[in-house]
Interface confidence: low
């Protein structure tokens, strides 16, 4: 028995073409980079920019490159032993909750609160209440002062696979 | 709404053939998706033949069905077909071709069914 | 290949009942990558299997929440908190990761 098709973003089309490049697998696995081919005997390269595959493994395909969607920005190519890392666009971010989509930032605080943590890839802005120094979280209500931020600057990327 | 229309019942004498068929609908047919075809013997459970990969013609299958069976696809119809050779009474069967989807491993959409009967 | 083995094969119940179906496989069906392709289908008389369950415990996008799914390994398990007329039919668990994916022999569920 040879395993199957895994979780998340495996692409058939981009099965072994008879030129990639083969080798043998290692106690029945392949090593990052390749993937196994169906009767288990020969390991086959990813296609560099198409699929990958990051640990030793037994896959019947490489793993499809992520696209970075638009409001994303491509901070690191895929090749054939890393996915694409693709991050949320200035003034934009994603939260761990909803991981599908970047979401504006909010441009100010809500009244009576005080901005104390800017716009990040990863979390928008932060605010405390002036008087307590409490973190607000949860809807922001409709009245919202002026206070505008800028957008922070992207310290570290938000790795997307899939 | 992601439809499989199967072909009719067939009813064929034992060494004969028979290809039946399944037009896909409702989605991109080339998309991540693989075509896998099912026999369910009379009152008895499932058994996987093989898929067909539709967007270059890949194809796996079930070691028992090797040699018996053939799979292909037509892209320009969306349709995938299914050939059965040397037909014997084992053989008689209903035959669900399904839809796998390629990122998680299970059959989220399954055909009507097609009654192949083999009978002198 | 990998034996999938239900039990019961038959399962007769009340309606508003509890019911609960075991699949027992050979062998781990863990896969390499950490995830175990265990998946649920009903097929009612007359019809098509359909996906109830993926991944062990994973409801397919419309199915009740009667409906659950458990276990590990090689022992895993469908509920049905209570059991509806509609939920009659042949249940059949199904491993997928590896080839060939198996089913088991179906378990039938009737009043």
């Known amino acids: 028995e040879s395993a199957l098709i895994t979780q998340q973003d495996l692409a058939p089309q981009q099965r072994a073409a008879p030129q990639q490049k083969r080798s043998s697998p290692s106690e029945g696995l392949c090593p990052p980079g390749h993937h196994i081919s169906e009767d288990g005997r020969d390991c086959i390269s990813c296609k560099y920019g198409q699929d990958y595959s990051t640990h030793w493994n037994d896959l019947l395909f490489c793993l499809r490159c992520t696209r970075c969607d638009s409001g994303e920005v491509e901070l690191s190519p895929c090749t054939t032993t890393r996915n694409t890392v693709c991050q949320c666009e200035e003034g934009t971010f994603r939260e761990e909750d909803s991981p599908e989509m970047c979401r504006k930032c909010r441009t100010g605080c809500p009244r009576g609160m005080v901005k104390v943590g800017d716009c990040t890839p990863w979390s928008d802005i932060e605010c405390v209440h002036k008087e307590s120094g409490t973190k607000h979280s949860g809807e922001v209500p409709a009245v919202e002062e002026t206070v505008t931020s800028s957008p922070g600057t992207p310290a570290s990327p938000c790795s997307l696979s899939g | 709404e992601v439809q499989l229309q199967q072909s009719g019942p067939e009813l064929v004498k034992p060494g004969a053939s028979v290809k039946i068929s399944c037009k896909a609908s409702g989605y991109t047919f080339t998309d991540y998706y693989y075509l896998n075809w099912v026999k369910q013997s009379h009152g008895k459970s499932l058994e996987w033949i093989g898929y067909i990969y539709p967007n270059n013609g890949d194809t796996s299958y079930n070691q028992k069905f090797k040699g018996k069976t053939t799979l292909t696809v037509d892209k320009s119809s969306s349709t995938a077909y299914m050939e059965f050779r040397s037909l014997t009474s084992e053989d008689s069967a209903v035959y669900y071709c399904?839809?796998?989807?390629?990122?998680?491993?299970?059959?989220?959409?399954w055909g009507t069914g097609t009654t192949v009967t083999v009978s002198s | 290949d990998v034996l999938m083995t239900q039990t019961p094969l038959s399962l007769p119940v009340s309606l508003g009942d509890q019911a609960s179906i075991s699949c027992r496989s050979s062998?781990?069906?863990?896969?390499?990558?950490?995830?175990?392709?265990l998946d649920w289908y009903l097929q009612k008389p007359g019809q098509s299997p359909k996906l109830l369950i993926y991944k062990v415990s994973n409801r397919f996008s419309g199915v009740p929440d009667r409906f659950s799914g458990s276990g590990s390994g090689t022992d895993f398990t469908l509920k049905i908190s209570r059991v509806v007329a509609e939920d009659l039919g042949v249940y059949y668990c199904?491993?997928?990761?590896?080839?060939?994916?198996?089913f088991g022999a179906g378990t039938k569920l009737e009043k």
């Open positions: 062998q781990s069906i863990v896969h390499s990558n950490g995830d175990t392709y």
């Open positions: 399904t839809r796998g989807s390629n990122w998680i491993w299970y059959f989220d959409v």
């Open positions: 199904f491993r997928g990761s590896h080839i060939p994916p198996t």
